[in-house]
């Protein structure tokens, strides 16, 4: 503790100039006085004055009145400071004396005669106020007040705390009354050393080192970082915890590029054909009749369907056709017969029976060949029966779909992953992207298809935290970290959610 | 009890970037209580506060060494790390990690045994 | 820039009080902390807050902070005491360090 007890002198009365002996001062009692604190105690002893004792230099001669003085020599109110703490009671012996030597430095003077002397014991509590007094014996009268001030930076009922007013890190605040802390505006601890963040900032998310400041952790983004930041690259998709990357409807993919549902996105069939989605970025387009081509973009001839029989031939016409019959044929089509079996119409050893009593006929045909009089060899590819693209190729009695690559099937109607083929070596991970496969390597392995032995691994010096699973290969910085639950941070390095004495952490 | 101990290379050549870590034991960098903060002391002089750093990551550094210098903190490890770049001869200091406690207006209550650093070619 | 200054060397008998000095502006509205260094050893803190002991410092280390100076006292000096001592307060948010004093016990 450190303080300081005041011990102002107001006025000194001696009108007859006598000594304490009776005796009487030439020319005048030159007055100076002698302070003594100490302790409390009953009955005053002589002893040391042991909480301090303070002289004056000659104040006036006989009766006169003291004035306040701040500075130099005869400073009044005299300042006896401590430091200790103020136990609440004290002894005070004021001493009046007459020096007939230096009036500066009277205490060093031989000769000194006692004038006279009070003694005050009891109890005082630290504060501003002055307490007065007056004190009178048969010759003298002496008028003072006094009080206890704590030092500066000293606080509390007996000076005992110590509090100095801070504006660093290692607090922001003002003392109280008391020696409390009181936080300046914007910080809050019990030193004042913890910032107030920006209101409504994300408690585990969000952190400050300043007042209504919001400053995100790593994965969080926003005001207040209460929003999370979704996978890298990641399309068309959202999270929920920082580097997720969800996908929309539709959509799928590591990084939600791979459109599921093209047919909606996209509409590529063409003049009205029925479009199905197969797989990312895969569809295919039912054609109605009259149209071909991937996406049934191209209309066919009206004579493509061969609507003409019995060898007639067909001549386009504007949104019609005409056939032209050969001999012994008629119709639209050139369905009727004028003919018989006894004119042999039946080519390529095809059988002749008689029909309508013998008015038409109908022949049976050999194998490979077709037609009313089994004019035509059989050509299996005329239906289209090869889907998405495949070429049709005909092979004696059969027929074969010649797939582009990415289908399969006997008319090349099922889609074949790209992963299929498993093109990723070491034991990469495949996913299928629009543009090929695209391999997720193992560590220690990078290349499109993982057959590049890396010799400095990036994730040897293990630079995921928490037992956070290391891949290489999917981003710019050559690794990626896959947190455990209850871990964010692309190293996998906070803990989500501590208790609240951690004000920050995340 | 708590340690503080300094690791990093006892050579930097002039112009390079002198690192040093400091590991804690004994106790959790993560404390709200304290400031983890490098001191150094050329051979023959007295000590400079070079920066120090909370465990949330705020910083403050000594002004004169402002623009060389960068101290972290990596909690998962319990270590916080010092950078000095562009040394030059009178950089050759032992440099001290030091806990810096609150509940003392600041005091470094605990110090690191020290690691003297040379800076020469 | 704020600065703490020490009288560079202090002799004092063993058994006797030593004092050491460290002044700067207004030092005594800022928290003062004293460090020992022995040759060798890293610093330890004797005194923080001015006048407080940290536990396991002898109470013959008392220190005191007023007006431009801060004092540490060391009563009944004892041969052990014989160190560098190392004045340091805080100036905003930067630490600061006075340049030392060698004490030596005579004897």
């Known amino acids: 503790g450190s303080g300081i007890f005041q011990l102002r002198l107001q006025e000194f009365v001696n009108q007859r100039g006598m000594l304490a002996n009776g005796q009487s001062c030439e020319p005048g009692c030159r007055t100076f006085f002698r302070i003594c604190l100490k302790h409390f105690q009953a009955t005053f002893s002589e002893g040391p004055c042991t909480f301090g004792n303070v002289s004056t230099p000659v104040l006036g001669t006989n009766s006169f009145v003291v004035r306040d003085k701040n500075s130099g020599s005869g400073r009044n109110p005299l300042q006896l400071p401590f430091n200790f703490t103020w136990p609440g009671t004290f002894s005070l012996n004021i001493q009046a004396w007459h020096t007939p030597g230096d009036d500066l430095r009277p205490e060093t003077s031989p000769g000194n005669s006692l004038i006279s002397q009070i003694i005050i014991q009891g109890s005082l509590a630290v504060g501003k106020i002055w307490r007065t007094d007056e004190q009178n014996d048969t010759l003298t009268r002496l008028s003072y007040s006094y009080r206890v001030i704590c030092s500066d930076n000293y606080y509390g009922e007996s000076c005992s705390r110590l509090c100095k007013k801070r504006d660093d890190h290692f607090g922001h605040y003002e003392c109280q009354p008391d020696g409390s802390l009181s936080c300046l505006p914007g910080w809050t601890g019990k030193y004042c050393d913890q910032p107030i963040c920006l209101s409504g900032c994300h408690e585990q998310n969000g952190y400050c080192s300043k007042p209504d400041e919001c400053i995100c952790r790593p994965g969080w983004q926003g005001r207040l970082c209460n929003e999370c930041i979704p996978h890298n690259g990641c399309r068309h998709g959202t999270c929920s915890i920082p580097w997720q990357c969800a996908c929309d409807e539709g959509w799928g993919g590591l990084f939600c590029d791979q459109d599921l549902n093209y047919c909606t996105h996209h509409s590529p069939c063409k003049n009205g054909s029925t479009c199905s989605n197969s797989g990312p970025k895969g569809y295919t387009c039912t054609c109605l009749p009259g149209y071909t081509g991937e996406h049934c973009e191209l209309g066919l001839s009206k004579c493509a369907s061969n609507p003409c029989r019995n060898g007639g031939s067909c001549k386009d016409q504007e949104n019609s056709y005409h056939c032209l019959c050969p001999p012994g044929y008629y119709g639209q089509h050139c369905e009727h017969s004028t003919l018989t079996c006894a004119d042999s119409p039946c080519f390529n050893g095809g059988s002749c029976r008689e029909r309508n009593q013998g008015s038409s006929y109908a022949c049976e045909c050999p194998p490979n060949f077709t037609g009313s009089n089994c004019e035509k060899k059989v050509d299996r590819c005329t239906s289209n029966p090869c889907a998405n693209g495949g070429q049709c190729q005909n092979r004696g009695p059969s027929r074969t779909c010649r797939c582009r690559p990415g289908f399969t099937g006997t008319h090349c109607e099922l889609h074949i992953s790209d992963c299929a083929r498993s093109p990723c070596a070491h034991g990469g991970t495949c996913h299928d992207l629009e543009n090929g496969p695209v391999c997720t390597c193992p560590a220690g392995f990078s290349g499109r298809r993982c057959e590049v032995r890396i010799t400095h691994d990036a994730c040897a010096s293990g630079p995921c935290f928490n037992g956070a699973t290391c891949y290489t290969g999917l981003s710019p910085n050559n690794f990626v970290c896959n947190c455990p639950y209850g871990f964010v941070g692309s190293r996998c390095e906070f803990p989500v959610g501590l208790p609240p004495s951690f004000p920050w952490v995340a | 009890e708590v340690q503080l101990q300094e690791s990093g290379p006892g050579l930097v050549k002039p112009s390079e970037t002198l690192s040093l870590t400091c590991t804690v034991s004994g106790g959790s960098i993560s404390s709200s209580s304290y400031y983890w903060g490098w001191i150094r002391q050329p051979p023959g002089k007295g000590l400079e506060w070079i920066g120090d750093?909370?465990?949330?990551?705020?910083?403050y550094y000594n002004p004169s060494l402002k623009s060389r210098v960068t101290i972290s903190v990596d909690t998962s490890k319990n270590q916080f790390s010092l950078k000095l770049s562009s040394v030059t001869a009178a950089d050759t200091a032992v440099y001290y990690c030091?806990?810096?406690?609150?509940?003392?207006?600041?005091?470094?209550?605990?110090w690191g045994q020290g690691t003297l650093v040379t800076v020469s070619s | 820039s704020y600065e703490l200054t020490q009288p560079p060397s202090v002799s004092v008998s063993p058994g006797q009080t030593a004092s050491i000095t460290c002044s700067g502006q207004?030092?005594?509205?800022?928290?003062a902390s004293w460090y020992q260094q022995k040759p060798g050893q890293s610093p330890v803190l004797v005194i923080y807050?001015?006048?407080k002991r940290p536990s396991g410092i002898p109470e013959r280390f008392s220190g005191s902070n007023s007006g431009d100076t801060a004092t540490l006292t060391i009563s009944g000096t004892q041969p052990m005491d014989e160190a560098d001592y190392y004045c340091q307060a805080w100036d905003r948010d930067t630490g600061v360090f006075g340049g030392g004093t060698k004490l030596t016990v005579l004897g």
């Open positions: 030091a806990r810096q406690a609150l509940a003392m207006g600041g005091g470094s209550d605990k």
């Open positions: 750093i909370y465990y949330t990551g705020s910083t």
């Open positions: 807050e001015d006048s």
């Open positions: 207004r030092l005594g509205d800022k928290y």
